[in-house]
């Protein structure tokens, strides 16, 4: 990720290409207080009845270049005995995020905004039961 220095001259918002060409300062300010982030759970992935694993999705031509993605460990959920419950399904919870993708044919500091669907965790849902009519 490359930090683009902010210009002292503000662009003209009236300009036709204003929304197509915006300078972004990529300096990340951690807005989460330490209390909030210390409560952020890292063990739910194992304690959940629909446990998941995390993989480090790397794309050097994307900002951020590292995104941690969840995958459900099982198709079914885990019951209190630690066995798979065939009446319950593990499903991935996905979130749509915006990322910046480098435009390779242009200079390394040119990016375009793209949507990306990221798995953030798994939850347990009851299986759909289809009754014979």
């Amino acid at each position: 990720a490359v930090l683009i220095p902010q210009s002292s001259v503000c662009p003209n918002a009236e300009a036709n290409n204003f929304l197509q060409n915006v300078k972004v300062n990529l300096k990340v300010i951690n807005s989460l207080s330490s209390k909030a982030s210390s409560r952020r759970p890292s063990d739910y992935l194992n304690r959940s009845t629909s446990p998941w694993t995390l993989s480090r999705n790397e794309d050097p031509d994307r900002y951020p270049s590292v995104i941690w993605e969840a995958q459900c460990r099982h198709q079914r959920c885990v019951n209190a005995e630690g066995k798979l419950d065939h009446h319950m399904n593990s499903v991935l919870i996905q979130q749509e995020i915006l990322v910046l993708k480098r435009e390779p044919e242009k200079c390394p500091f040119t990016f375009r905004v793209e949507k990306m669907l990221v798995g953030v965790g798994c939850t347990c849902v009851s299986s759909i039961v289809r009754h014979a009519s």
């Epitope: 930090l3 989460l32 982030s37 480090r56 790397e58 050097p60 941690w68």
Partner: antibody, heavy 119, light 107 residues
Framework: EVQLVQSGAEVKKPGASVKVSCKAS????????FHWVRQAPGQGLEWIGV????????AYNQNFRDRATLTADKSTSTAYMELSSLRSEDTAVYYC????????????WGQGTLVTVSS | DIQMTQSPSSLSASVGDRVTITCKAS??????VGWFQQKPGKSPKLLIY???NRYTGVPSRFSGSGSGTDFTFTISSLQPEDFATYFC?????????FGQGTKLEIK
């Protein structure tokens, strides 16, 4: 002030396991990745793997996937690297280092832990 | 894995000299290269990130350049405290890899 303080030197027998700790202070532990790197005597640096204390995710260098285990304890802001089935070639200084995921570089390093594997 | 080939492996120079170390990646790593200084018994210290950006507090005599596969690290005027080993490193894709190091010695 950001500090990464590692546990002391260890001497182990071949086949044994070692667990090295790295205690972080001066910043929010769950915000950044922890990477582990080793340096054999007179050699270059070799990347072992990464853990993100915020979500518990891990990734490993293929060369260490079967023997290394990375964990983190949020209550004590400590990251751990366990290496099993030790052999003499594992004699090295092991470093923990903080990786700024968004900015994309290693900024702070622990002081290193020397692990000697000898029969 | 991406190989980082660093040269020279050792270098003798005098205080005030200009010194250049090169690093060649086995494939393009864009600008995702860092340079580290390491003194005996100490941990590596970040000097340059993203090929050419000086890290906070690093003196201006240290500089870096390059992109793609070829990278250069320069010390414009050697100071007594600069005699150490220098490593390049790529964080373009894991497993992250390092050059073998250049030992800078007093002539």
């Amino acid at each position: 002030e950001v500090q990464l303080v590692q546990s002391g030197a260890e001497v182990k027998k071949p086949g044994a396991s070692v667990k090295v700790s790295c205690k972080a202070s001066g910043y929010t532990f769950t915000d950044y990745e922890f990477h582990w790197v080793r340096q054999a005597p007179g050699q270059g640096l070799e990347w072992i793997g990464v853990i993100h204390p915020g979500n518990g995710g891990t990734a490993y260098n293929q060369n260490f996937r079967d023997r290394a285990t990375l964990t983190a304890d949020k209550s004590t802001s400590t990251a751990y690297m366990e290496l099993s089935s030790l052999r003499s070639e594992d004699t090295a200084v092991y470093y923990c280092t903080r990786f700024l995921t968004y900015e994309g570089y290693f900024d702070y390093w622990g002081q290193g832990t020397l692990v000697t594997v000898s029969s | 894995d991406i190989q980082m080939t660093q040269s020279p492996s050792s270098l003798s120079a005098s205080v005030g000299d200009r010194v250049t170390i090169t690093c060649k990646a086995s494939q393009s790593v864009s600008i995702d290269v860092g340079w580290f200084q390491q003194k005996p018994g100490k941990s590596p210290k970040l000097l340059i990130y993203h090929a050419s950006n000086r890290y906070t507090g690093v003196p201006s005599r240290f500089s870096g350049s390059g992109s793609g596969t070829d990278f250069t690290f320069t010390i414009s005027s050697l100071q007594p405290e600069d005699f150490a080993t220098y490593f390049c490193q790529q964080d373009y894709s894991s497993p992250y890899t390092f050059g073998q190091g250049t030992k800078l010695e007093i002539k």
